[in-house]
């Protein structure tokens, strides 16, 4: 039960995280005009990865896309790339983890396959979360550098003769959304990796033994106390008895009449 809960929770946390990464990537408020010492200008500027916006004091907002690829700073391109890679990996991870969930049955998928898929999705979530955190952090670092540069230049113009008031930019809401979302995806990935350990069946020296009752075509499995009619594939090459205590999760991992396909 604990493994199922860990896996399920990991999936949900990662799902929320990836939704957050997508939201952060699409948001316009990656950097916002610094309003610390009262507004200097009558317009409010804010910028995203894809466009920059200006909100007039009337509330009218106008956004312009960055319609150039070569003219953009390399750092911005790097941040875009990291966020997209994070989203793509996260999306694939989600797809993989859906099939890996214990509560979902697809044909006669073995536990070892589910364990491998859980691990794969977990790693994908971890990398996705790291990409998002890295992307947001690179952008934040870029902002901090520019902020202090513009602060240093704020009241120095040509030879200190001209006073120039520069628009300074500070952290926008998207950065915080990105950090939290990246962290959640990372945590979700770790949870999936932990769940994988519980899912992976342990190797044993015991083989399944079939007892043939004279009157019936029934295979008795001493370890799991489960029976299945006929000599189908589920009696063949299947580890039945592992010689140790069995968790509730492991018992549930065998198909029974209570399972829903």
């Amino acid at each position: 039960m604990a493994v199922t809960a860990c896996q399920g929770l990991g999936f949900v946390v990662s799902l929320i995280g990836i939704a957050g990464i997508i939201a952060a990537t699409c948001m316009d408020q990656w950097s916002t005009q610094d309003l610390y010492n009262n507004p200097v200008t009558a317009v409010f500027n804010y910028q995203g990865l894809w466009r920059s916006c200006v909100r007039e004091s009337s509330g009218f907002t106008e956004c312009r896309g960055y319609f150039t690829l070569l003219g953009l700073p390399a750092m911005l391109q790097a941040v875009r790339a990291l966020m997209i890679v994070g989203i793509v990996l996260g999306a694939i991870g989600l797809l993989v983890s859906i099939f890996a969930l214990k509560c979902i049955r697809i044909g006669s998928m073995e536990d070892s396959a589910k364990a491998n898929m859980t691990l794969t999705s977990g790693i994908m979530f971890i990398v996705s979360g790291l990409c998002a955190i890295a992307g947001v952090s690179v952008f934040a670092n870029m902002l901090v550098t520019n902020f202090w540069m513009s602060t240093a230049n704020m009241y120095t113009g040509m030879g200190g003769m001209v006073q120039t008031v520069q628009t300074r930019y500070t952290f926008g809401a998207a950065l915080f959304v990105g950090w939290v979302a990246g962290g959640l995806t990372l945590i979700g990935g770790v949870m999936m990796c932990i769940a994988c350990r519980g899912l992976a069946p342990e190797e044993t020296n015991y083989k399944a033994v079939s007892y043939h009752a004279s009157g019936h075509s029934v295979a008795y499995k001493p370890g799991g106390f489960k029976a299945s009619t006929g000599f189908g594939s589920n009696t063949k090459n299947k580890k039945i008895y592992d010689g140790g205590a069995r968790t509730e999760d492991e018992v549930q991992s065998y198909p029974s009449k209570h399972d829903y396909v």
């Epitope: 009262n38 507004p39 200097v40 200008t41 009558a42 317009v43 500027n45 804010y46 910028q47 920059s52 916006c53 200006v54 007039e56 004091s57 009337s58 009218f60 106008e62 312009r64 001209v162 006073q163 120039t164 008031v165 628009t167």
Partner: antibody, heavy 119, light 113 residues
């Protein structure tokens, strides 16, 4: 159409205060900023400040802080500017002007109120 | 505060003539976020309140005759009246509506000879 109605003249004594009104009509009063501008006889224009009727948020020209106080009465679609401790320097025409939506310019102006400070 | 310097004043012209007046700001009025210049031109006829002519340095207000043209960027701006009419007799003010406090130029008085 948009109209900003202001009283023609206000005669006040030095040291007293005056409250100039500006009644708006023909548009949604709470949507646009209301600006106040001073013009001394035969001189240029000076921006006093602005107020947003929806929430009474305001910005003042530092020069007029303490001298002018901007308020609004949403129920009557009227903006007010109170001028305190009046001196002869405050004798001027005071205009209210409606802020434009797309830019920060002043789209419509009242006819102006001539405030005369005289003993 | 941003200083707006207008020239010349006064400006005497003949009806039908093309006239150009300039406005300089002590600081750039160009907002890089939307590449717009926050400079406005107003016309004030004798005994009347100012009237909005041009905003964003070059966008003509609706109802304003197309003989009025605004141009310029950054710190240098011009208002051109292509064929001056008798009714254009007025004082023309430029205004910074980007930085607080909003500031006006001293005005260019257009006189008809």
């Amino acid at each position: 159409q948009v109209q900003l109605q202001q009283p023609g003249t206000e005669l006040v004594k030095p040291g007293a205060s005056v409250k100039v009104s500006c009644k708006a009509s023909g548009y949604t009063f709470t949507t646009y900023w209301m600006h106040w501008v001073k013009q001394r006889p035969g001189q240029g224009l000076e921006w006093i400040g602005r107020i947003r009727p929806s929430d009474s948020d305001s910005n003042y020209n530092q020069k007029f802080k303490g001298k002018a106080t901007l308020t609004v009465d949403k129920s009557s679609d009227t903006a007010y500017m109170q001028l305190n401790s009046l001196t002869s320097e405050d004798s001027a025409v005071y205009y209210c002007a409606m802020g434009a939506y797309f830019s920060n310019s002043f789209a419509y102006w009242g006819q102006g109120t001539l405030v005369t400070v005289s003993a | 505060d941003i200083v707006m310097t207008q020239s010349p004043s006064p400006l005497t012209v003949i009806v039908g003539e093309k006239v150009t007046m300039t406005c300089k700001s002590s600081q750039t009025l160009l907002n890089r976020g939307n590449q717009k210049n926050y400079l406005t031109w107003y016309q004030q006829k004798p005994g009347q309140p100012p009237k909005l002519l041009i905003y964003w340095a070059s966008t003509r207000e609706s109802g304003v005759p197309d003989r009025f043209t605004g141009s310029g960027s950054g710190t240098d701006f011009t208002l051109t009246i292509n064929s001056v009419q008798a009714e254009d007799l007025a004082v023309y003010y430029c205004q910074n509506d980007y930085f607080f406090p909003f500031t006006f130029g001293s005005g260019t008085k257009l006189e008809i000879r």
